[in-house]
Interface confidence: low
């Protein structure tokens, strides 16, 4: 007998063909011999089966000898062997209906687990294989689990259910709630305005929740809440903000914070958390601030950086148009009795300049001796 796989909630067409291409008597019955539908004269008649109100046939194809049965809004319990009786012959079709659903909401936070459950008819032994938008493959039987969702798992998952060499494909849309970047670093000269942006890696029609930015300054012994805010339908309203520094926050998404000026005492790292309404857990994004200061004091030209820098970063003092350079893999570099001219302080990573500050050194004239 022929095996047909169907999807819960979908429509399936079970075909039955007569050898003569003409309108003739036919019946569809279930395995208990209960009539579902058939033909009487040129009218479609329905039997006492509980499936009858969801069953139909393509009348336009009857005179071509095609007597298909269409079942709408498939249910797992529709799985059965269906018999088409036409021209004194019987054609059997085994219908197996499967359902694949996510155990929880399909909007999940990064790091949470996704469990997919397969509903299947008794006696079947299907296998399931799912492919994430990023190409990750998982397979299993009745349940499939993705223990820790990542940003790249957002999108349409394609799952193939196989049974008796037949397959049926399910599409499940998964939204991983996360920020676009796990971490970002802003490099600024002392006194410059600092912009922090936290774009989400998802779009939701309504976005409601509350958030907070905790800041650990390099110079401070403990972290401090810099700002708390509410999010109501994608509009941001500040609840509380520290007096020093006085952050400003944009009223629309993406979340946008402005620090009036970069100062060594603010250099450090922060953690922005966003708790969304009706979700357990929080979205996190780390943000780092590196501040540079170049100063000349008496005969000493110094360049310093504060904040989380990696040991492989190079700090250099360079005299413009001259070969004079002092470089160190350290947080401070200095030159004693620097030559006059425009000096550049550079923070670089493998030759790529991350931050640059210029300072002009004026020639020092010897003080005239008083007579």
């Amino acid at each position: 007998k022929k095996v047909v796989l169907g999807k819960k909630g979908d429509t399936v067409e079970l075909t039955c063909n007569a050898s003569q291409k003409k309108n003739t008597q036919f019946h569809w019955k279930n395995s208990n011999q209960i009539k579902i539908l058939g033909i009487q004269g040129s009218f479609l008649t329905k039997g006492p089966s509980k499936l009858s109100d969801r069953a139909d046939s393509r009348k336009s194809l009857w005179d071509q000898g095609c007597f298909s049965m269409i079942i709408k809004n498939l249910k797992i319990e529709d799985s059965d062997t269906y018999i088409c009786e036409v021209e004194n012959k019987k054609e059997e079709v085994e219908l197996l209906v499967f359902g694949l659903t996510a155990n929880s909401d399909t909007h999940l936070l990064e790091g949470q687990s996704l469990t997919l459950t397969l509903e299947s008819p008794p006696g079947s032994s299907p296998s399931v294989k799912c492919r994430s938008p990023g190409g990750k493959n998982i397979q299993g039987g009745r349940t499939l689990s993705v223990p820790q969702l990542e940003r790249q798992d957002s999108g349409t998952w394609t799952c193939t259910v196989s049974q008796d060499q037949k397959t049926v494909e399910f599409k499940i849309d998964i939204v991983v709630l996360a920020f676009q970047k796990a971490s970002s670093t802003v490099y600024k000269k002392e006194g410059e305005q600092v912009e922090f942006s936290f774009p989400p890696a998802f779009t939701l029609e309504k976005l409601t929740g509350s958030g907070e930015l905790w800041w650990q300054a390099e110079r401070a012994s403990s972290s401090k809440s810099w700002i708390t805010f509410d999010l109501k339908n994608k509009e941001v309203s500040v609840k509380r903000v520290t007096q020093d520094p006085k952050l400003q926050m944009g009223k629309k998404l993406p979340l946008h914070l402005t620090l009036p000026q970069a100062l060594p005492q603010y250099a450090g790292s922060g953690n922005l958390t966003l708790a969304l309404e009706a979700k357990t857990g929080k979205l996190h994004q780390e943000v780092n601030l590196v501040v540079m200061r170049a100063t000349q004091f008496q005969e000493n030209l110094t360049c310093e950086v504060w904040g989380p820098t990696s040991p492989k970063l190079t700090l250099s003092l360079k005299l413009e148009n001259k070969g004079t350079t002092v470089s160190k893999q350290a947080k401070a570099v200095w030159v004693l009795n620097p030559e006059a001219g425009m000096w550049q302080c550079l923070l670089s990573d493998s030759g790529q300049v991350l931050l640059e500050s210029n300072i002009k050194v004026v020639p020092t004239w010897p003080t005239p001796v008083q007579p």
Partner: antibody, heavy 118, light 111 residues
Framework: QVQLVQSGAEVKKPGASVKVSCKAS????????ISWVRQAPGQGLEWMGE????????YYNEKFKGRVTMTRDTSTSTVYMELSSLRSEDTAVYYC???????????WGQGTLVTVSS | DIVMTQSPDSLAVSLGERATINCKAS??????????MNWYQQKPGQPPKLLIY???NLESGVPDRFSGSGSGTDFTLTISSLQAEDVAVYYC?????????FGGGTKVEIK
Amino acid sequence: QVQLVQSGAEVKKPGASVKVSCKASGYTFTAYVISWVRQAPGQGLEWMGEIYPGSGSSYYNEKFKGRVTMTRDTSTSTVYMELSSLRSEDTAVYYCARSGDGSRFVYWGQGTLVTVSS
Amino acid sequence: DIVMTQSPDSLAVSLGERATINCKASQSVDYDGDSYMNWYQQKPGQPPKLLIYVASNLESGVPDRFSGSGSGTDFTLTISSLQAEDVAVYYCQQSLQDPPTFGGGTKVEIK
């Protein structure tokens, strides 16, 4: 089910301090803000402040700043509210309440009566 | 702070009759299409109980004879058919701005 259980009634002298506890159960303690609301005898309701149990950060009504301190102990899922420099007008029932979305109070403790009398 | 003014202070209504309580905010409590107004019921010796949130949403488990309406600065709590168990003090509360503030309360009794 969500439960907030508060400590028993207290009688204090003017100038003293009182510390009221609120033990939470039936939900993830660190996930919801706990507010303190008081009600003087025969009077209305007054919000005193709130604490974020996850971070421990707390925010107070200007009226009580300098006199109120809210703390939490995550190991016991308990929030504390301490009010100092008590005066007779601080005689009230003090409630802890768990917020739902925003500052609407869905779950309440049974209340703690604090009497300030010389 | 937003000041909430309730009226009347007390109200006597016959069983099965309609009870209406008003609440006026000193400034609008609307934000992005929603009105951040909540209503509570308090019976003697008990903590308040949330009835209505965001002006008109019925809290789970609250009988549907309670309803809320209004926007901006003017809000109303209605009990369509007063029952004996509805005897209590009712408070309005705004949750738009810190600090959250409550109305002075309306005592509902049976006539």
